[in-house]
């Protein structure tokens, strides 16, 4: 679509005659009558294919033509087209006399014909006016011609539409030649594709409005290269998203479980030594005088049971009194006035005689100690029961009664939830206080791992040489389609062609 | 335990000002994005900005651009919202969570009433 | 904006009975869908993420299914604790946008 245009810019008829060489009266009012249409070699009358266009009367004789576009469009003349420019025309200008006010061809004698030009030849679209000057015997004809392209049209012969947009479905200006011209900040076939914020990261990364960075779920940041750790995460930082790398001291799936609970909560009272030894675990080591988990518990004197030899022991508001069996004396009833003739060894015991008699020697069956084999053995002195179990004295044994959570002889076995494998697919489990958790491996979900879904094989792009690349969703792997010349699973493998 | 405490609602004419503040604790607070969410009977829960852990990069609704700041001090594990331009469509309860735009709202804090009245 | 509707808008249950709600998103926004339970009073807490993954400490009862546009959050045998209402929320486009909420009530 165009329109061909022609500027009339001077008609000289300096005797006022017609074609028939009769003069006007009083002179020749000029109009003209303008048939655009296909080439032909010899231009020959018939249909006007492209168009005609008539003037009203534009001066009398010899007269130049004003350029008037404002009233209707007069001047330059407008001949428009609804095709492609074919770049060949004929033009037909002929100079008509106006005796009276109309112009109808029906109107008009035959003889009122001034003067009738022919040109035809190749016109290509553009700006540029070509200027011609045709003469006769009595007239001459000046003016100027050329095809342009109509509004939205464009290209070589006004063939291309391009309409200039901006909004969601394209972004641009039209070139001369009908292509498109994206708008600052907008690429794409159709200018549709936001250009983000530069250093914006390609796949964590998007925009929907140009110098723009939105990230991807798991991603945060001006450019989108820093992950978000793991919503569960309390004392934790990624390196991809979602993961939970436990900061300094902290422990845990989740990294809330204390690794310098010692510092961070001072469990241990009565100036006892606190010892970590492990996750949200720690050992107290108890002055004297205190026991318990936290040595919160203080001890009577009496309970280290000082006093030997049968001797009972009586707690004082400074300390303790050991009240001595006949036969013995001492702070703590350690020295003895007795020999083996005494029979000073009890509960089975058997009795050696030391220096010449002076002195003796108990020798204790099992369960029984002190120097006169008084004591039973408490095999519980020791606390050999961990994670806060409870030390039981069972005859010649001991056994320890464990705190819920834990197992083993000495209770030093965690329970864990998840000795019964309860992932399926081969996701991870990991124990936590109140129970388990299942990391799942690419393909699974589920809080048990046993969702199947789908994954994209093909999102890390195996495939070489611009192979196709296609997802198999029921085993979840991934088929090349290779181009010709290159063979392999991969597509790596190029074939020696012919 | 995650505790996220606000403060600084109240009652503001139109066209003032107020700044909200979230205490955070419990959690390494630099290490997490941040956000706040409001909730009004008319509208509903509305995400209205967010800022980010590694760079401090903000985000907000289109409604508040331009009148509203989010900001964070790590020193003082506190995360802030300062509301200028107030308008009437502004009331509502504004919550401080944990998370992104682009993330879950992990933990929530008990939130604070803003109204916008004359 | 990608809009989050949720049905019913109430809904009124026995107890140990199952519950389902829906949430439809008007695009697709992938496994990016979060559920959230409100207390009267409280602040929402959130109960799942990545649709079907129940945050720390939610009880087994309640689970989320659903992918693309079409979600939903099943509650199965109902406990008094469990009368709230129940939010679905997106977190695949930006900006995060919230459903309307089911409130739910025990018959």
């Known amino acids: 679509s165009g329109v061909f245009q022609l500027q009339l810019q001077e008609f000289i008829n300096e005797r006022g005659v017609l074609a028939s060489g009769r003069p006007c009266e009083p002179g020749c009012r000029t109009f003209f009558r303008v048939c655009l249409k296909h080439f032909q070699a010899v231009v020959s009358p018939g249909p006007c294919t492209f168009g005609t266009v008539s003037t009203p009367v534009l001066g009398t004789n010899s007269f130049a033509v004003r350029d008037d576009s404002s009233g209707g469009g007069r001047n330059p003349l407008q001949l428009p087209f609804n095709f492609t420019w074919p770049g060949t025309f004929s033009l037909i200008i002929e100079a008509w006399h106006a005796p009276g006010d109309d112009l109808r061809p029906e109107a008009l004698p035959p003889d009122a014909l001034i003067s009738k030009i022919a040109i035809q030849g190749s016109l290509a679209v553009g700006q540029n006016w070509l200027l011609d000057e045709q003469t006769s015997t009595l007239t001459r004809l000046r003016y100027s011609y050329r095809v342009i392209c109509s509004d939205n049209y464009y290209g070589d012969n006004c063939s291309r539409l391009c309409k200039k947009r901006n909004d969601h479905f394209g972004h641009y200006v039209c070139q001369p030649d009908g292509n498109l011209s994206c708008l600052p900040g907008w690429t794409g076939e159709y200018c549709q594709q936001p250009i983000c914020l530069s250093g914006c990261h390609e796949q964590n990364g998007y925009c929907s409005k140009p110098a723009e960075c939105l990230c991807r779920p798991g991603w945060q940041g001006r450019l989108c290269n820093e992950c978000i750790p793991h919503n569960g995460c309390r004392h934790g930082t990624c390196s991809t998203p979602w993961q939970c790398t436990c900061d300094e001291g902290w422990g845990g799936l989740f990294c809330d479980q204390d690794l310098n609970y010692c510092t961070h909560h001072s469990p241990c009272k009565n100036g006892a030594t606190c010892s970590n030894s492990g996750q949200r675990s720690y050992t107290c080591t108890c002055r004297p005088g205190y026991t318990g988990v936290d040595c919160e518990l203080e001890l009577s004197e009496c309970d280290s049971n000082p006093c030997r030899n049968g001797g009972s022991c009586k707690d004082q508001e400074d300390g303790y009194h050991c009240l001595c069996p006949p036969g013995y004396y001492g702070l703590h009833c350690e020295h003895s006035t007795l020999s083996c003739a005494d029979s000073p060894c009890f509960n089975g015991g058997s009795c050696r005689e030391r220096n010449q008699g002076a002195n003796y020697a108990c020798e204790c069956p099992p369960n029984f100690t002190g120097s006169n084999c008084e004591k039973k053995v408490d095999r519980c002195t020791s606390n050999p029961c961990a994670n806060g179990g409870q030390c039981l004295n069972r005859g010649p044994s001991r056994m320890c009664r464990c705190r819920p959570g834990f197992t083993g002889t000495y209770c030093e076995l965690h329970v864990s939830d998840c000795a019964r494998n309860p992932c399926a697919h081969g996701g991870t489990c990991h124990d936590l206080e109140n129970g388990l958790m299942c990391t799942c491996p690419a393909g699974f979900s589920g809080r048990r791992c046993e969702v199947r879904t789908s994954i994209d094989a093909c999102a890390s792009s195996p495939c070489f040489n611009r192979a196709t690349c296609y997802t198999d969703l029921s085993t979840d792997t991934f088929v090349c389609n290779c181009p010709y010349g290159f063979v392999g699973s991969r597509c790596e493998f190029p074939v020696g062609l012919p | 335990e995650v505790q996220l405490v606000e403060s600084g609602g109240g009652l503001v004419q139109p066209a003032n000002s107020l700044k909200l503040s979230c205490a955070a604790s419990g959690f390494t607070f630099s290490n997490f994005p941040m956000a706040w969410v409001r909730q009004s009977p008319k509208k509903g829960l509305e995400w209205v900005a967010t800022i980010s852990s590694s760079d401090g990069t903000t985000y907000y609704r289109d409604s508040v651009k331009g009148r509203f700041t989010i900001s964070r001090d790590n020193a003082k594990n506190t995360l802030y919202l300062q509301m200028d331009s107030l308008r009437s469509e502004d009331t509502a309860t504004y919550y401080c969570?944990?998370?992104?735009?682009?993330?879950?709202?992990?933990?929530w804090g008990q939130g604070v009433l803003v109204t916008v009245s004359s | 904006d990608i809009r989050m509707t949720q049905s019913p808008a109430s809904l009124s249950a026995s107890l140990g009975e199952t519950v389902n709600i829906e949430c439809r998103a008007s695009e697709d926004i992938y496994s990016n869908l979060a559920w959230y339970q409100q207390k009267p009073g409280k602040a929402p807490q959130l109960l799942i993420y990545d649709t079907n993954n129940l945050a720390d400490g939610v009880p087994s009862r309640f689970s989320g299914s659903g992918s693309g546009t079409q979600f939903s959050l099943k509650i199965n045998s109902l406990q008094s604790e469990d009368v709230a209402t129940y939010y679905c929320q997106q977190y695949n486009n930006y900006p995060p946008t919230f459903g309307g909420g089911t409130k739910l009530e025990l018959k």
């Open positions: 969570a944990r998370g992104y735009y682009n993330s879950p709202f992990a933990y």
